[in-house]
């Protein structure tokens, strides 16, 4: 994929970043050893990645979260990633569940996604969870990324 | 990615090996339904992946462990992979932790690990783990690789 | 990888599909948010996909399933990517394994399977399981794909 | 811009230890991503021996030290601290801390603050 200034390669890889809001989706920062390989992939509000080309791109994401079966809700932990498109509904591409461990005060686990979607000009991607305050934001724990075929 | 000579795919897959050294770092070897490409990447010493030319490359890495809650110690299960730059820091890229299982005599787990990281000429990416003694080395549980973008 | 009519893009992701079918091979669909690049690469009796060109893949699962351990084999949960070139045996390419939950009165768990391997033309790769009814197919748990390095 | 200055360094028997700090000031410590250790042989090239996050503390080793140095850090203190026991007159060399920026990128060669470097020599 190593390209020309007519189809350049495009690829970011971003670090989680612990944030005060109550809101479901994952922050996300350029520090540490992330990629931004040019402005045609952009980190958008420290929430999305956002792409200017249309194509296939593989996007993954990671998350690491510590948890435990009684301070949880029943529901499993859920790790979505979502899709934003101009003019039309969000969906979700990918999701993975983990149930809650029954370790004390907390159990690790580690949920890994990844496929290739079709983006559009415009198009933005970011990750939901069920409880942001489980997800574990040690070194190299959580991270979201992408790349164009 | 199909390129010319000027511009070779660079991939690797290898498979892993047990090792009665008592290192955390994993060993792979070149068996099985490996991949490598061309001796732009090679592995060295059974341990890391090192590659010849700057670029992005998609890293991966896929580790199956059988432990036990009981007979293992608090912390959990965590796999990382590494990477070492001439004259650089060495610096964990990614890391996933799984808690112990309470089954008996222990519980199999899967990690996957992956990520878009630019690597500078003579890099080298490795796997470190916890207890290698926990890790399941039958065909296709546990595995390490690398794509150029 | 944005390619010339010589050298098109081949990229899949298949969405998994409830089966009345008693066989452990996982059933795709192209539905939802699927993607088939062209006919170089196809979804074959919705439980294979096959490449029509020789070269190196990344090829991924994601399994999502929802299991008990006092319901189920004493036996882990593994999810196994493999291969069918023609004239050869199948061969296994990865797996993963993940012991069943204690949580009544089932625990959801995710696997994910990912590597970068030669296909021949016409080879096939598809996906095994210990137990297909045990397979969560909500929307984005379990899918399927490769694309072409 | 982070001033690096490293202290601890000399002469010790094989088997011993010493312990030596690298005090930082200048740039806030919360622009820190990692600070480390170096250490540069007569006639060799530099080599990494030890790094640790601030984000969480945690560490990476050279193989050659892995079970004899430590590496810590006292956030309040701005100061990193390299424990090294066991020492083996192969450790003789001159040891360098370094800190890397927060926002380094592996798309870019950031460059890490240097100390001016500390000699330490393992003989009987």
């Known amino acids: 994929m190593q390209k020309g200034d007519q189809n350049p390669q495009i690829a970011a890889h971003v670090i989680s970043e612990a944030s005060s809001k109550t809101t479901s989706v994952l922050q996300w920062a350029e520090k540490g050893y992330y990629t931004m390989s040019n402005n045609l992939v952009t980190l958008e509000n420290g929430k999305q990645l956002t792409v200017k080309r249309q194509g296939l791109y593989y996007i993954y994401a990671q998350v690491t979260f510590c948890s435990n079966r009684e301070a949880s809700s029943q529901a499993p932990f859920i790790a979505s990633l979502c899709l934003k498109s101009p003019g039309r509904f969000e969906r979700i591409l990918l999701r993975a569940a983990n149930t809650h461990s029954s370790a004390k005060p907390c159990g690790q686990q580690s949920i890994h996604l990844g496929g290739v979607f079709e983006l559009q000009p415009g198009a933005s991607v970011f990750v939901n969870v069920t409880d942001p305050s489980q997800v574990s934001h040690g070194t190299g724990f959580t991270s979201f990324g992408l790349l164009k075929l | 990615m199909q390129k010319g000579d000027q511009n070779p795919q660079i991939a690797a897959h290898v498979i892993s090996e047990a090792s009665s050294k008592t290192t955390s770092v994993l060993q792979w070897a070149e068996k099985g339904y490996y991949t490598m490409s061309n001796n732009l990447v090679t592995l060295e010493n059974g341990k890391q992946l090192t590659v010849k030319r700057q670029g992005l490359y998609y890293i991966y890495a896929q580790v199956t462990f059988c432990s036990n809650r009981e007979a293992s110690s608090q912390a959990p299960f965590i796999a990382s992979l590494c990477l070492k730059s001439p004259g650089r820091f060495e610096r964990i890229l990614l890391r996933a932790a799984n808690t112990h299982s309470s089954a008996k005599p222990c519980g199999q787990q899967s990690i996957h690990l992956g990520g878009v990281f630019e690597l500078q000429p003579g890099a080298s990416v490795f796997v470190n783990v916890t207890d290698p003694s926990q890790v399941s080395h039958g065909t296709g549980f546990t595995s390490f690789g690398l794509l150029k973008l | 990888m944005q390619k010339g009519d010589q050298n098109p893009q081949i990229a899949a992701h298949v969405i998994s599909e409830a089966s009345s079918k008693t066989t452990s091979v996982l059933q795709w669909a192209e539905k939802g948010y699927y993607t088939m690049s062209n006919n170089l690469v196809t979804l074959e009796n919705g439980k294979q996909l096959t490449v029509k060109r020789q070269g190196l893949y990344y090829i991924y699962a994601q399994v999502t399933f929802c299991s008990n351990r006092e319901a189920s084999s004493q036996a882990p949960f593994i999810a196994s990517l493999c291969l069918k070139s023609p004239g050869r045996f199948e061969r296994i390419l990865l797996r993963a394994a993940n012991t069943h939950s204690s949580a009544k009165p089932c625990g959801q768990q995710s696997i994910h399977l990912g590597g970068v391997f030669e296909l021949q033309p016409g080879a096939s790769v598809f996906v095994n399981v210990t137990d297909p009814s045990q397979v969560s197919h909500g929307t984005g748990f379990t899918s399927f794909g490769l694309l072409k390095l | 811009e982070v001033q690096l200055v490293e202290s601890g360094g000399g002469l010790v028997q094989p088997g011993g230890s010493l312990r030596l700090s690298c005090a930082a000031s200048g740039r806030t410590f919360s622009s820190i991503y990692a600070m480390g250790w170096f250490r540069q042989a007569p006639g060799k090239e530099r080599e990494f021996i030890a790094v640790?996050?601030?984000?969480?503390?945690?560490?990476l080793y050279a193989d050659s030290v892995k079970g004899r140095f430590t590496i810590s850090a006292d956030n309040s203190k701005n100061t990193a601290y390299l424990q090294m026991n066991s020492l083996k007159p192969e450790d003789t060399a001159v040891y360098y801390c370094?800190?890397?920026?927060?926002?380094?990128?592996?798309?870019?060669?950031?460059?890490?603050?240097w100390g001016q470097g500390t000699l330490v020599t393992v003989s009987s």
């Open positions: 370094a800190a890397e920026p927060y926002g380094s990128g592996s798309s870019l060669i950031s460059e890490y603050d």
């Open positions: 640790i996050y601030w984000r969480d503390g945690s560490t």
